[in-house]
Interface confidence: low
């Protein structure tokens, strides 16, 4: 007996071929011997089956001795043995219809779980194997679960149902709702304007929710909310903002915040949270601000950084075009009685300069100039 696999909602075409290459009488019946369709001359006739409005054939093929049964908008309950009667012969085709659906929504927050449920006809024993967009394979029976969804799980999941050595494939588009980056770091000289950007890793027609940026300054004992905002159809409106610092926020996506100037008291770490309408849980992105200041006070040239620097970062003071006078894995370095000239304060990681501040040291009778 021939086995054909179908997908719920799809169309299937069951073939039936006569040895004579001409239009002759045929009938398609189900396993209960109820007529589905057949022909009377060149006319298509339909029986009293439940498939009545979804069953069809291709009259154009009858003259070639082909009498297909087409079933549209397949349902699980269409799984049955279909019998084609032609030329005193009976051709049997077993149709098995499967469905695969995602648990709730196909738009899920990063860290949430995805459950895929297989609908299958009674008596079948299919195996299911799904491949995520990042190539991860999971296998199961009636249900497959993936916990802790990651950003790379966004995209097309390809699931293959195997039954009787036949395969049918489902493709489900999953969108993992997350920011593009889990964390970012901004390096600025004291007084410079600071831009924070929080691009989303997904696009949807309408995006509604609310968000907040909490900030833990290095010098502060506790964190505080710097700004709260609403998001309505991708339009941003600020609800509440601190006066110090007074952040400005862009009115369109991607979420964009501007700090008028980088000051040591603002250096630290922030956490932007975004709660989306009709979703449980929140999206998070961490942002860090490192601030550098170079000063000369009497005979002491000092360079300092504030904010979350890693222990392997190197802070150096050097006279332009000369070797570093001092380099330390510390947050402050200084030179006593510096020579006149343009001094550079450099914050670097494995030789790559992350932040640079220049200060001009004049001969001892003059005042230092900061460019």
């Amino acid at each position: 007996k021939k086995v054909v696999l179908g997908k719920k909602g799809d169309t299937v075409e069951l073939t039936c071929t006569a040895s004579q290459k001409k239009s002759i009488q045929f009938h398609w019946k189900n396993s209960n011997q109820i007529k589905i369709l057949g022909n009377q001359g060149s006319f298509l006739t339909k029986g009293p089956s439940k498939l009545n409005d979804r069953a069809d054939s291709r009259r154009s093929l009858w003259d070639q001795g082909n009498f297909p049964l087409i079933i549209k908008n397949l349902k699980i309950e269409d799984s049955d043995t279909y019998i084609c009667e032609v030329e005193d012969q009976k051709e049997e085709v077993q149709l098995l219809v499967f469905g695969l659906t995602a648990n709730s929504d196909t738009h899920l927050l990063q860290g949430q779980s995805l459950t895929l449920t297989l609908e299958s006809p009674p008596g079948s024993s299919p195996s299911v194997q799904c491949r995520s967009p990042r190539g991860k394979n999971i296998q199961g029976g009636k249900t497959l679960s993936v916990s802790q969804l990651e950003l790379q799980d966004s995209g097309t999941w390809t699931c293959t149902v195997l039954q009787n050595q036949k395969k049918v494939e489902f493709k489900i588009d999953i969108v993992v709702l997350a920011f593009q980056k889990a964390s970012s770091i901004v390096y600025k000289k004291e007084g410079e304007q600071v831009e924070f950007s929080f691009p989303l890793a997904f696009t949807v027609e309408k995006l509604t929710g609310s968000g907040e940026l909490w900030w833990q300054a290095e010098r502060a004992s506790s964190s505080k909310s710097w700004i709260t905002f609403d998001l309505k159809n991708k339009e941003v409106s600020v609800k509440r903002v601190t006066q110090d610092p007074k952040l400005q926020m862009g009115k369109k996506l991607p979420l964009h915040l501007t700090l008028p100037q980088a000051l040591p008291q603002y250096a630290g770490s922030g956490n932007l949270t975004l709660a989306l309408e009709a979703k449980t849980g929140k999206l998070h992105q961490e942002v860090n601000l490192v601030v550098m200041r170079a000063t000369q006070l009497q005979k002491n040239l000092t360079c300092e950084v504030w904010g979350p620097t890693s222990p392997k970062l190197m802070l150096s003071l050097k006279l332009e075009n000369k070797e570093a006078k001092v380099s330390k894995r510390e947050k402050a370095v200084w030179v006593l009685n510096p020579e006149a000239g343009m001094w550079q304060c450099l914050l670097s990681d494995s030789g790559q300069v992350l932040l640079e501040s220049n200060i001009k040291v004049l001969p001892t009778w003059s005042t230092p100039v900061q460019p």
């Epitope: 491949r131 190539g135 394979n137 293959t160 395969k167 494939e169």
Partner: antibody, heavy 118, light 113 residues
Framework: QVQLQESGPGLVKPSETLSLTCTVS????????WSWIRQPAGKGLEWIGR???????NYNPSLKSRVTMSFDTSKNQFSLKLNSVTAADTAVYYC????????????WGQGTLVTVSS | DIVMTQTPLSLPVTPGEPASISCRSS????????????LDWYLQKPGQSPQLLIY???YRASGVPDRFSGSGSGTDFTLKISRVEAEDVGVYYC?????????FGPGTKVDIK
């Protein structure tokens, strides 16, 4: 049964862009992954990449910087663009689809020869 | 990228006799999560496009005669033809699809002695 037919110019000048289209009949373009493979004369097969109707793509890293794939569901077509071509890109280009067997290439077009020459 | 190698590169055969082609991958094609081995075999007959013979190590594609069979594990794979027929001539390629980019073997040319 799904049938595929490649079309496009048979001759492309060096440094220009190679553009090919694959027309799908006997099936919906929305159902499968759509791939491009090439074969230089007398040589083996090289997988260029594939596209799905969600727009998600997977490209061969060796060609990624030069390749763009797209589709037009209304015309049941998908296309390949390969820019900055050289003589090394001369090959028979095939379009293919998985046909519901995971990532395997179940249906292939008959192939079209593209020669890169001035 | 995963490198695929095939032996022999040329195989003269006698109709009615068995034939065997070997394929090796530079890393395992067995997916430990699902137990599947992501290796396919394709045949390119003279002047034609390639056609799928065997997928996921051992499943015969639709319409492929049962004289073709695929086997193997990990990194070593074999395509067997139990009784070669004249229509089986052409170039046989193995292909891995456990990771991107998918890669093909160099091909084995089968012709009649």
């Amino acid at each position: 049964q799904v049938q595929l037919q490649e079309s496009g110019p048979g001759l492309v000048k060096p440094s220009e862009t190679l553009s090919l289209t694959c027309t799908v009949s006997g099936g919906s373009i929305g159902s499968y992954y759509w791939s491009w493979i090439r074969q230089p004369a007398g040589k083996g097969l090289e997988w260029i990449g594939r596209i799905y109707t969600s727009g998600s793509t997977n490209y061969n890293p060796s060609l990624k910087s030069r390749v763009t794939m797209s589709f037009d569901t209304s015309k049941n077509q998908f296309s390949l663009k390969l820019n900055s071509v050289t003589a090394a890109d001369t090959a028979v280009y095939y379009c293919a689809t998985d046909g519901g067997v995971g990532d395997s290439l179940d249906y292939w077009g008959q192939g079209t020869l593209v020669t890169v020459s001035s | 990228d995963i490198v695929m190698t095939q032996t022999p590169l040329s195989l003269p055969v006698t109709p009615g006799e068995p034939a065997s082609i070997s394929c090796r991958s530079s890393q395992s094609l067995l997916d430990s999560d699902d137990g599947n081995t992501y290796l396919d075999w394709y045949l390119q007959k003279p002047g034609q496009s390639p056609q799928l013979l065997i997928y996921t190590l051992s499943y015969r594609a639709s319409g492929v005669p049962d004289r073709f069979s695929g086997s193997g594990s990990g990194t070593d794979f074999t395509l067997k033809i139990s009784r070669v027929e004249a229509e089986d001539v052409g170039v046989y390629y193995c292909m891995q699809h456990i990771e991107f980019p998918f890669t093909f073997g160099p091909g084995t040319k089968v012709d009649i002695k």
